[in-house]
Amino acid sequence: MKVLQEPTCVSDYMSISTCEWKMGGPTNCSAELRLLYQLVFQSSETHTCVPENNGGVGCVCHLLMDDVVSMDNYTLDLWAGQQLLWKGSFKPSEHVKPRAPGNLTVHTNVSDTVLLTWSNPYPPDNYLYNDLTYAVNIWNENDLADSRIHNVTYLKPTLRIPASTLKSGISYRARVRAWAQHYNTTWSEWSPSTKWYNSYREPFEQR
């Protein structure tokens, strides 16, 4: 049994780090492999993650953490029974992928404006809470070329756009993702999309 692509891990900087790797051939990850992880700190336990399959040769494991601070470092050991396949380490603060924003809602009852709101995926006591900026993707359901990205660089999880910038009588979808500038993170996954119908019509004298 051989590791083809070594584990790479990303942390949500809250309670979960996700590690993925590829094996040299088809593998029943949960039956054959175990990823052991231990915080490098006095008297910390060695926990065991039972991986799950991620494609034919891919495996994924979720490492559970109570909290994350910048100096945390974990040792990782990938075992197949009593055989050590790979040994490595992981510093969560250096490989952050934020959680996806949630509760994306579209408010169209404000005249001439489409208001999008969403929730910050972190509690206020988390370091990332005040460091997130967002990208909002809006697209026309019937014409994928009619798509745009709005960068939200302020802290408030809201975006206002004039309804007149969207085609009338068309269904649109929106989704949002986040990143944290000061932690040099990757982008989060996109939030689930939400749909609305743009019923805005230009005033008669502007037609």
Epitope: E45, L64, M65, D67
Partner: antibody, heavy 128, light 109 residues
Framework: EVQLVESGGGRVQPGGSLRLSCAAS?????????MCWVRQAPGKGLEWIGC????????TYYASWAKGRFTISKASSTTVYLQMNSLRAEDTATYYC????????????????????WGQGTQVTVSS | DIQMTQSPSSLSASVGDRVTITCQAS??????LAWYQQKPGKAPKLLIY???TLAYGVPSRFSGSGSGTDFTLTISSLQPEDFATYYC???????????FGQGTKVEIK
Amino acid sequence: EVQLVESGGGRVQPGGSLRLSCAASGFSSSSAHYMCWVRQAPGKGLEWIGCIYAGSRGSTYYASWAKGRFTISKASSTTVYLQMNSLRAEDTATYYCARAAFVNRGVSWIWPYYFSLWGQGTQVTVSS
Amino acid sequence: DIQMTQSPSSLSASVGDRVTITCQASEDIESYLAWYQQKPGKAPKLLIYRASTLAYGVPSRFSGSGSGTDFTLTISSLQPEDFATYYCLGSSYSTGSNIFGQGTKVEIK
């Protein structure tokens, strides 16, 4: 210094109740773990009672014999309790608090496995 | 619940002896087995976890082996401070339960 300190032991009448506490100190706040209770009757072996996950999920596991009369709860990730009800003479023992590693599959299936660090124990005597 | 059968229940040995204690699980527990040492009036001390991994600060004369249902603790050369009671702890994947063996008391011959 890393340590676990139990308190709340003492003498109680049969049928009575008692709540034991365990306070942990010296650990990294980052380290997820279970907090568990194990007991040992005089001159007997070790007997696992149950565990509670110290993180936000707070899931609990109990030995089959302990379900119903024994309840483990937590005030925080560093303070846990063992509530014992309808106590009997055979519950007389030293009660230890222990910190445990876990096995997880995904983020919702987590179970405790070995006890890495133990408190000094607190004595409970059930007698009339 | 699983059952852990530990043997022998007691043994007499001399300093320098090689000592072996076995533990058998009633079902397959992979490598989820730990060994503890307990001295009178003291809390147990972790020696080995994951069947064969030595806990931090434990002397290398202690070793563990086995997987599945059969496990062994070996003390390669018994020292005066090793006279104590030893317990195995098996953890069941299916039920989340943790069961101790009955204990093995190692006494001076």
